[in-house]
């Protein structure tokens, strides 16, 4: 699986999850998030050669098409597969609020 | 929605579904598919600026991150959202078989 266990331990050029730390204030301008200061959102990148973690029949077909027609602009793209939530602390006035934001952390990727 | 109705009628540079005809024999080397000869598989392409048909909170965050950090390599990618099946005819020896291949035709795209 193209997950953090594999991708963070290997120098993988093809589609894989990559570490990306995002600081809420500096990188997003989100001053309203008090905790955490930032988090590992991660991201997916790398080429999608034929059959590499193909998401659907279409991505398999497109991967083969791209292999046999290298000049073609159509090819699958490396995108998030499994995502995890992130719990944040923020304030509404003087009242603290804790919220779980869904799909914030990429744990694995796929070719779609 | 970034679907065929919209994308095929507009000159859209950003993420959209694009027409792509695939000939089974010529483009994939699939001699075993007898009907249809080919089909419009279509594909997704184009930049994913902040908030454009964002698939998840992560893609929204990544889109914003990319806007504020233009030099960053991390950005959402334009990939299939809705896919439709395709019915094909092939032969197993001298016996005709009809099969519905799922997720073969891209009808709309999203930024993921």
């Amino acid at each position: 699986a193209l997950d953090t266990n594999y991708c963070f331990r290997n120098l993988e050029e093809n589609c894989c999850v990559r570490p990306l730390y995002i600081d809420f204030r500096q990188d997003l301008g989100w001053k309203w998030v008090h905790e955490p200061k930032g988090y590992y959102a991660n991201f997916c990148s790398g080429p999608c050669p034929y059959l590499r973690s193909a998401d659907t029949t279409h991505s398999t077909v497109l991967g083969l098409y791209n292999t046999l027609n290298p000049e073609a602009s159509a090819s699958p793209c490396c995108v998030p597969q499994d995502l995890e939530p992130l719990t944040i602390l923020y304030y509404v006035g003087r009242t603290p609020k804790v919220e779980q934001l869904s799909n914030m952390v990429v744990k694995s990727c796929k070719c779609s | 929605a970034l679907d065929t109705n919209y994308c095929f009628r507009n000159l859209e540079e950003n993420c959209c579904v694009r027409p792509l005809y695939i000939d089974f024999r010529q483009d994939l080397g699939w001699k075993w598919v007898h009907e249809p000869k080919g089909y419009y598989a279509n594909f997704c392409s184009g930049p994913c600026p902040y908030l454009r048909s964002a698939d998840t909170t992560h893609s929204t965050v990544l889109g914003l991150y990319n806007t504020l950090n233009p030099e960053a390599s991390a950005s959402p990618c334009c990939v299939p959202q809705d896919l439709e099946p395709l019915t094909i005819l092939y032969y197993v020896g001298r016996t005709p078989k009809v099969e519905q291949l799922s997720n073969m035709v891209v009808k709309s795209c999203k930024c993921s």
């Epitope: - | 001699k31 007898h34 019915t87 197993v92 005709p96 009809v98």
Partner: antibody, heavy 119, light 111 residues
Framework: EVQLVESGGGLVQPGPSLRLSCTAS????????MSWVRQAPGKGLELVAD??????????YYSDSVKDRFTISRDDSKSIVYLQMNSLKTEDTAVYYC??????????WGQGTLVTVSS | DIQLTQSPSSLSASVGDRVTITCRAS??????????MHWYQHKPGKQPKLLIY???NLASGIPSRFSGSGSGTDFTLTISSLQPEDFATYYC?????????FGGGTKVEIK
């Protein structure tokens, strides 16, 4: 260009054997089923024998009129299909065509070879 | 086995005529939207030639005056304007199941 060339036909008395050959070129022979179709004088086309590719275990078919007398075989290394005809009868007199069916239709045909069974 | 019955067994026509040949199967030769019926032209001393495959698809190099239609058990071959070189015997053939069989043929003669 697809070419199918039959050979081996001729005049033979009832009873003995004859082997027809069909040499194929211009297509991926190994991938496709091959057939022998005949036309007897004044009659229509009849599929007499058929053999599919190795992928489908070289499965064969014979029409009732030739079953247990005729044998179809193929040599993929030489791109040749054979029709071994034993215990020939006068009603086997016909033009025998070699043909290839990539799908459900017989797309290409040889020029035919005449087999005459007569005493 | 599926039997194919062609009609008429023979017909006389003139150059320029519209000719229609029918082929009826003893059971359906269609599967889903695919119609597994094919048509051939056979001239004396020549090998048969594929005209139409899967009921309505024109084979490579065949003039557009030839057309096919039908589904299920009833199929038609039409020659829109008969030409001198079209005088021949025409056969239908199915591939719905093994064994594939041919119709008895329709001989098109000069009137």
């Amino acid at each position: 260009e697809v070419q199918l060339v039959e050979s081996g036909g001729g005049l033979v008395q009832p009873g003995p054997s004859l082997r027809l050959s069909c040499t194929a070129s211009g297509f991926d022979f190994n991938s496709y089923g091959m057939s022998w179709v005949r036309q007897a004088p004044g009659k229509g086309l009849e599929l007499v024998a058929d053999i599919v590719s190795k992928t489908y275990n070289y499965t064969t078919y014979y029409s009732d009129s030739v079953k247990d007398r005729f044998t179809i075989s193929r040599d993929d290394s030489k791109s040749i299909v054979y029709l071994q005809m034993n215990s020939l009868k006068t009603e086997d007199t016909a033009v025998y065509y070699c043909t290839v069916a990539p799908g459900g239709s017989f797309d290409y045909w040889g020029q035919g070879t005449l087999v005459t069974v007569s005493s | 086995d599926i039997q194919l019955t062609q009609s008429p067994s023979s017909l006389s026509a003139s150059v320029g005529d519209r000719v229609t040949i029918t082929c009826r199967a003893s059971q359906s030769v269609s599967i889903s939207r695919f119609n597994l019926m094919h048509w051939y032209q056979h001239k004396p001393g020549k090998q048969p030639k594929l005209l139409i495959y899967r009921a309505s698809n024109l084979a490579s190099g065949i003039p557009s005056r030839f057309s096919g239609s039908g589904s299920g058990t009833d199929f038609t071959l039409t020659i829109s304007s008969l030409q001198p070189e079209d005088f021949a015997t025409y056969y239908c053939q199915h591939s719905r199941e093994s064994p594939w069989t041919f119709g008895g043929g329709t001989k098109v003669e000069i009137k």
